[in-house]
């Protein structure tokens, strides 16, 4: 397993509709054809997997049907979007990138993006 640098923004504020987007960029040392991206959430010293997708370079990311994540890739950048967020989902979202094929296997873990989700004021039809 070889180390790889992964960059992501430090802070993102979710929209009033509970949507947060951020870019996860990795420094690919070679020409990977198969990449796996995992989003982890760290809160209260617990780390849980939010979503994961494997994609072939040049193709769309494919998350599971019931995933709360969507994403697109462009070169060594992955644009990730998480939906359905509310205040209790505030936390540090860590981007983990694995270059699966061809060998050698590379692993990179970002420092995390702190996503803040705010409960809107109680007004008609606001998003919570």
């Amino acid at each position: 397993c070889k180390a790889m640098h992964v960059a992501q923004p430090a802070v993102v504020l979710a929209s009033s509709r509970g949507i947060a987007s951020f870019v996860c960029e990795y420094a690919s040392p070679g020409k990977a054809t198969e990449v796996r991206v995992t989003v982890l959430r760290q809160a209260d010293s617990q780390v849980t997997e939010v979503c994961a997708a494997t994609y072939m370079m040049g193709n769309e990311l494919t998350f599971l049907d019931d995933s709360i994540c969507t994403g697109t890739s462009s070169g060594n950048q992955v644009n990730l979007t998480i939906q359905g967020l509310r205040a209790m989902d505030t936390g540090l979202y860590i981007c983990k990138v694995e270059l699966m094929y061809p060998p050698p296997y590379y692993l990179g873990i970002g420092n995390g993006t702190q996503i803040y989700v705010i409960d809107p004021e109680p007004c008609p039809d606001s998003d919570f």
Epitope: T48, V50, D66, I68, Q83, G84, D89, S126, F128
Partner: antibody, heavy 123, light 107 residues
Framework: QVQLVQSGAEVKKPGASVKVSCKAS????????MHWVRQAPGQGLEWMGI????????NYAQKFQGRVTMTSDTSTSTVYMGLNSLRSEDTAVYYC????????????????WGQGTLVTVSS | DIQLTQSPSSLSASVGDRVTITCRVS??????LNWYRQKPGEIPKLLIY???SLQSGVPSRFSGSGSGTDFTLTISSLQPEDIATYYC?????????FGQGTKLEIK
């Protein structure tokens, strides 16, 4: 095991107020949102509002704005729903239901409901 | 205001039939939709969340699909205990509106 236990049935006169309680047990109270949903006799489900027990933040359905108040007491793991200026059409069974944050592992929304509290408004 | 419209409002089917209930939403909600079953005199029970995730303990004859504004609940082989009213609901964002319900009866 997870339980949401609601207060007993109430009979109220038009114009009066009612306060229904929902006591949670078997899970971390402040880690889940709580909703209130009502169902008039023979009718469908109607969402009333949501409260975040950890912050006290609330959001109410437009229909109930100004007439409903939802609060939580973390010391007793209880949420309350108060409805004032009662009218006959408020006669219904009132339910509380818990709702985890979307990022909670194996968390499903509205997975546990209280047993329901019948509120009858009659002169 | 967001609206959820279920169809049909009621339906009658035979044991073993494949039954489909649809829920149309007035705006795009991605996949953030629940399905419930409520038997007469009982509290609602969660069947499907996030459009297609089967809730723990729910029989595999229930399945959900759809995204955006059009969603479907399917019962692959109707059982006598499925006599109930079924509701869809928008979740994870207020207002958490319910559909008007679909009453399912056995022929």
């Amino acid at each position: 095991q997870v339980q949401l236990v609601q207060s007993g049935a109430e009979v109220k006169k038009p114009g009066a107020s009612v306060k229904v309680s929902c006591k949670a047990s078997g899970y971390t109270f402040t880690s889940y949102y709580m909703h209130w949903v009502r169902q008039a006799p023979g009718q469908g489900l109607e969402w009333m509002g949501i409260v975040n027990p950890s912050s006290g933040s609330t959001n109410y359905a437009q229909k109930f704005q100004g007439r409903v108040t939802m609060t939580s007491d973390t010391s007793t793991s209880t949420v309350y729903m108060g409805l004032n200026s009662l009218r006959s059409e408020d006669t219904a069974v009132y339910y509380c239901a818990r709702d985890p944050p979307i990022t909670m592992v194996r968390g499903a929304p509205f997975d546990y409901w209280g047993q329901g509290t019948l509120v009858t408004v009659s002169s | 205001d967001i609206q959820l419209t279920q169809s049909p409002s009621s339906l009658s089917a035979s044991v073993g039939d494949r039954v489909t209930i649809t829920c149309r939403v007035s705006q795009d909600i991605s996949r953030l939709l629940n399905w419930y079953r409520q038997k007469p005199g009982e509290i609602p029970k969660l069947l499907i969340y996030r459009a297609s995730s089967l809730q723990s303990g729910v029989p595999s004859r229930f399945s959900g699909s759809g995204s955006g504004t059009d969603f479907t609940l399917t019962i692959s082989s109707l059982q006598p205990e499925d006599i109930a009213t079924y509701y869809c609901q928008r979740t994870y964002s207020a207002p958490y509106t319910f559909g008007q319900g679909t009453k399912l009866e056995i022929k």
